[in-house]
């Protein structure tokens, strides 16, 4: 009974930094809540970006500093991440935990890689 | 560094009561599951309970379901394992331990505390 | 619930040997760790994943295995790798453990 989550292997991030995606998971039983983590893996270092846990059929709702928003249907979350900069490209990986009711599932996404590129600085403009 | 320490383990009779903690530090507590895991004497590992995150959650193995409480207070980095009705099967090294960040597999243990259930 | 079987039961080998270590689980299985523990010890976790070392854990010790087989290897034992070693599955709940296989110096 694994539970398989599926995101993109490759995502650009817009010129204003903000990169979305989307996390699917193929839900094993019939879970009433879930948590949704976002971690990124760069080198042999894991961060976890952000983390939700949602109601299913609610909308879920990251932190107030979080720099993750994200909108949920059925087994799929939206993801959207935001203030990125070329520092944060990166492996970002989908982690789904279906909480309750028991048993409790776990599924992990292969990752996706967001490459972040700064915009070049407007050129002084002489008028 | 990630430090675990359990307290409240000792002898008690069947059918009496026992409570332990585990001092948490060195980690963002509520960003983790907090597990207890025991082991009999002379014998393997058997998880025993999980508490996630905000507390609200919390998972039981069938064999001390409806007799342990699994709780934590974020506050005070701290778990705990209200045990009641204790049997003398329940005797074990009690360990805490903090679920790893790739799920629910267990990183960082306690040294343990021993509770004897003996008449 | 997921059973575990370990294998052996013992392993007795020489410091230098390699050693591989069995877990086979009663059904599929997504996600598995491997332990070791010494005689008066907690347990510290070598390998999560199937194939994944933890933070300290020296290369001589490797995971791999998916579905229901899962191999713990030591490439060359040390004197300090002689000890209880345990799998454990944590895909879905109740999570489950291996009863172990003790690695002893022949």
């Known amino acids: 009974k694994a539970m398989h989550v599926a995101q993109p292997a490759v995502v650009l991030a817009s010129s204003r930094g903000i990169a979305s995606f989307v996390c699917e998971y193929a839900s094993p039983g019939k879970a009433t809540e879930v948590r949704v983590t976002v971690l990124r893996q760069a080198d042999s270092q894991v961060t976890e970006v952000c983390a939700a846990t949602y109601m299913m059929g609610n909308e879920l709702t990251f932190l107030d500093d979080s720099i993750c928003t994200g909108t949920s249907s059925g087994n799929q979350v939206n993801l959207t991440i935001q203030g990125l900069r070329a520092m944060d490209t990166g492996l970002y990986i989908c982690k789904v935990e279906l909480m309750y009711p028991p048993p409790y599932y776990l599924g992990i996404g292969n990752g996706t890689q967001i490459y972040v590129i700064d915009p070049e600085p407007c050129p002084d403009s002489d008028f | 560094q990630v430090q675990l320490v359990e307290s409240g383990g000792g002898v008690v009779q069947p059918g009496r009561s026992l409570r332990l903690s585990c001092a948490a530090s060195g980690f963002t507590f509520s960003n983790y599951g907090m597990n207890w895991v025991r082991q009999a004497p002379g014998k393997g590992l058997e998880w025993v309970a999980v508490?996630?995150?905000?507390?609200?959650?919390?998972h039981y193995a069938d064999s001390v379901k409806g007799r342990f409480t699994i709780s934590r207070d974020n506050s005070k980095n701290t778990l705990y394992l209200q045990m009641n009705s204790l049997r003398a099967e329940d005797t074990a090294v009690y360990y805490c331990a903090r679920g790893g960040d790739w799920g629910p597999y267990f990183d960082y243990w306690g040294q343990g505390t021993l509770v004897t259930v003996s008449s | 619930e997921i059973v575990l079987t370990q294998s052996p039961g013992t392993l007795s080998l020489s410091p230098g040997e390699r050693a591989t270590l069995s877990c086979r689980a009663s059904q599929s299985v997504s996600y598995l760790a491997w332990y070791q523990q010494k005689p008066g010890q907690a347990p510290r976790l070598l390998i999560y994943?199937?194939?994944s070392r933890a933070t300290g854990i020296p290369d001589r010790f490797s995971g791999s295995g998916s579905g229901t087989d899962f191999t713990l290897t030591i490439s060359r034992l040390e004197p300090e790798d002689f000890a209880v070693y345990y799998c454990?599955?944590?895909?879905?709940?109740?999570?489950?453990f291996g009863q172990g296989t003790k690695v002893e110096i022949k």
């Open positions: 994943g199937a194939s």
């Open positions: 508490i996630w995150y905000d507390g609200r959650n919390k």
């Open positions: 454990q599955q944590y895909g879905s709940s109740p999570w489950t």
